[in-house]
């Protein structure tokens, strides 16, 4: 270990000045001691102050009680200024000052950087009384020192309630060049420029950068750390790395690929996750980015029969979540899907196509022609209506729901029932006199119930009353209320 | 110009409490230690504590500890006093002196001195 | 904790005179010793801190000597603005304590 005192032998006051961090001294005296001196004169003789004449043939009376021994100064002793030493090798310091007794329980700490180190440090005082004063030595040890515990050094010492301390020890440790700014793969656009930085740190200083591209050096001649290594542009893929030289040796860089952006690569296994009758959710893998991030995708949605006219819906969206919903097709339809996707360079070719198949829908018409009539005499509603005009996607019709509601005197009731396919007429039950019957009827397949028709009204004149449960079960007595003439 | 003003005069009940204030100006408060002294009327000088400004640190002379507790306000360059329990033993006038140290040497002493409180405990 | 045994309590001279203070310590306190003069009303002033040193402003009539256990202060040819209390202190170890007082008064 180099150990390098950078401070000369020289004199310095008999009270020097304030520590760094010391609280403020003043009227520093004018006398001057050897550095290497012990103790000093606590006050051999008074000094003047600078300006004041000095009080002469004045009378003082003699002193009774002499000093056994002049106090030391309230600092700490000058030390070796700066250590320099390689990584991995120990080093021992020491601060040391001396206290007169009457200051019992005086602890030293260490403190670097500005900060108190506590806990886990090799840090011991040593206590060597004398009658009247003790020289204190608290040393600081380091087994194996690494470049963190570079840095500035302290004592400190709590004397009636001040903070007395030392000068610093600057710790140097030196070893291999250490990376503190690596260079970073980048994914770079083809012949374009684009930068690379290396840094590296001592101690020792200076730092010199050698670049290396592929195995092979780039610059013939070093260049001072920090280095910025300008690549005017590459047409394929390559690795860089750089080289910190010091006096201590060799340091190399972790290898970092360069790669050419391109066109993405198409998505893979595209899968329907649900089918409904208008709308489709899919999925897909995306394909390699080709070293540029998605921006979006777009799904191309085909239909597949052979008479349509061919014609491509497109759909854009986010590259993310690799999940879209396609909307607004056909019922029963069966349609081909392919997904592109694109980065900056552009679109990716369309993923293989996939056929998919929307259900059955519900019917998009109501019936028409819709009407209504009282059978007097058999006491019922007749109601007539026509087929909708059924299209293919919507579906095999099963059936008709009729809705009936009654309306008398603030009271209202909403009955449902259920027609099969093959009729086109119903007959209902009154089921009150003196009021309105509103009818309107809707087509009904497995894909769900169409819209039902405009309502139709009939009035029922008062006959007396049909009397009925509040429920929407037939009145006892009655016949099935719903009859397919 | 280094001035230490304290606050004005305090009139308290017995077993009350009391804080006075000193304000430091003209200097780096941070510097310097603030020491308290007590003056009972027609005595000498009793020296109550100090306070380091920058950590808060303070040390009491015995027969004060439990009486007074000294504080800082660093950023209005304040040292305060509380006086608790009050009793007409306390009735006297108080200082606060600004401590400083004759180079690297043992030897401290008082250089500026506040303006005094004076508190009087009475029922 | 050491004690400052101050004397004379009080002294009554003349303008003109001089007049020599003592403060002895109860044990060794080396120059760790500071004299204030105080005028009636008003807060303590530092007249000289170190045993020896005048402190900035203090007219060079005034003087401080001794060490150890054995201080003085002393007033060659008193003034009339110099008459008041005067105080020793000591700075040794974690307490200060003040001497009784010395009363300085107009003959």
């Known amino acids: 270990a180099i150990t390098e005192a950078r401070e000369e032998a020289k004199p310095y006051p008999l009270f020097p000045g304030p520590f760094p961090g010391s609280l403020q001294t003043d009227h520093t005296p004018l006398l001057s001691l050897p550095h290497a001196s012990g103790y000093q004169p606590a006050l051999m003789f008074s000094p003047t102050q600078p300006g004041r004449p000095h009080t002469g043939n004045v009378a003082i009376p003699q002193v009774t009680s002499v000093e056994s021994k002049p106090l030391p100064p309230l600092a700490f002793k000058h030390t070796v200024g700066h250590i320099i030493l390689s990584e991995h090798k120990g080093v021992k310091f020491n601060c040391s000052i001396s206290v007169p007794n009457i200051y019992q329980d005086t602890t030293i700490s260490w403190w670097k950087d500005g900060k108190e180190l506590l806990g886990a440090h090799h840090a011991i005082t040593q206590f060597y009384p004398d009658d009247e004063v003790t020289a204190i030595i608290a040393s600081f040890s380091i087994t194996s020192v690494q470049r963190s515990d570079n840095g500035s050094y302290i004592c400190k010492m709590k004397i009636n309630n001040e903070e007395i301390v030392s000068d610093p020890i600057y710790i140097e440790v030196q070893g291999l060049p250490h990376f503190t700014k690596q260079p970073e793969s980048m994914n770079v656009t083809r012949n374009t420029a684009f930068n690379l930085t290396c840094q590296a740190v001592g101690p020792p200083e200076p730092v010199n950068i050698f670049w290396v591209q592929n195995s092979s050096r780039v610059n013939e001649q070093p260049e001072k750390s920090p280095s910025v290594l300008t690549v005017p542009g590459l047409t394929e893929m390559a690795v860089f790395s750089c080289e910190a030289h010091n006096d201590k040796g060799l340091t190399v860089s972790k290898g970092v690929q360069i790669n050419i952006k391109a066109i993405p690569s198409p998505p893979t296994e595209v899968s329907i996750r649900n089918s409904t009758a208008h709308s489709i959710l899919i999925s897909w893998v995306p394909g390699f980015d080709g070293y540029s991030p998605f921006r979006n995708c777009s799904i191309q949605v085909k239909e597949a029969d052979p008479l349509s006219n061919g014609s491509v819906m497109i759909f854009n969206t986010s590259a993310l979540p690799h999940l879209y919903q396609i909307k607004q097709l056909q019922a029963l339809a069966n349609y081909s899907i392919g997904v592109s996707c694109m980065n900056e360079i552009g679109w990716s070719a369309v993923s293989p196509w996939i056929l998919a198949s929307t259900t059955e829908g519900a019917p998009s018409v109501a019936p028409l022609n819709v009407t209504v009539f009282l059978n007097e005499s058999s006491d019922n509603v007749d109601i007539r209506w026509m087929k909708p005009p059924t299209k293919q996607q919507d579906g095999e019709l099963v059936g008709y729901r009729i809705s009936h509601v009654w309306q008398s005197a603030g009271i209202s009731k909403e009955l449902l029932e259920e027609v099969g396919q093959n009729g086109s007429r119903a007959r209902i039950s009154v089921q009150v006199h003196n009021a309105t019957c509103t009818v309107r009827i809707a087509a009904v397949t497995r894909g769900g119930v169409g819209p039902f028709s405009d309502p139709v009204k009939i009035f029922i004149p008062a006959h007396g009353w049909v009397d009925y449960a509040p429920s929407s079960t037939p009145a006892p007595g009655n016949a099935d209320p719903v009859l397919i003439i | 110009e280094v001035q230490l003003q304290q606050s004005g005069p305090e009139l308290v009940k017995p077993g009350a409490s009391v804080k006075i204030f000193c304000k430091a100006s003209?200097?780096?408060?941070?510097?310097?230690?603030m020491d308290w002294v007590k003056q009972s009327h027609g005595k000498s000088l009793e020296w109550i504590g100090d306070?380091?400004?920058?950590?808060?640190?303070?040390i009491y002379n015995q027969k004060f500890k439990g009486k007074a507790t000294l504080t800082v306000d660093k950023s209005s360059s304040t040292a305060y006093m509380e006086l608790r329990s009050l009793t007409s033993e306390d009735t006297a006038v108080y200082y606060c002196?600004?401590?400083?140290?004759?180079?690297?040497?043992?030897?401290?002493?008082?250089?500026?001195w506040g303006t005094g409180t004076t508190v009087t405990v009475s029922s | 904790d050491i004690q400052m045994t101050q004397s004379p309590a009080s002294l009554s001279v003349s303008v003109g005179e001089t007049v020599t203070i003592t403060c002895r310590a109860s044990e060794n306190i080396y120059s760790s010793l500071a004299w204030y003069q105080q005028k009636q009303g008003k807060s303590p002033q530092l007249l000289v801190y170190?045993?020896?040193n005048l402190a900035d402003g203090v007219p060079s009539r005034f003087s401080g000597s001794g060490s150890g256990t054995q201080f003085y202060l002393k007033i060659n040819g008193l003034q009339s603005e110099d008459f008041g209390s005067y105080y020793c202190q000591h700075f040794w170890g974690t307490s200060y304590t003040f001497g009784g007082g010395t009363k300085l008064e107009i003959k």
């Open positions: 306070i380091n400004p920058n950590n808060g640190g303070t």
């Open positions: 170190a045993a020896t």
């Open positions: 003209g200097y780096t408060f941070t510097a310097y230690n």
């Open positions: 002196a600004r401590r400083r140290r004759y180079g690297n040497t043992y030897y401290w002493y008082f250089d500026v």
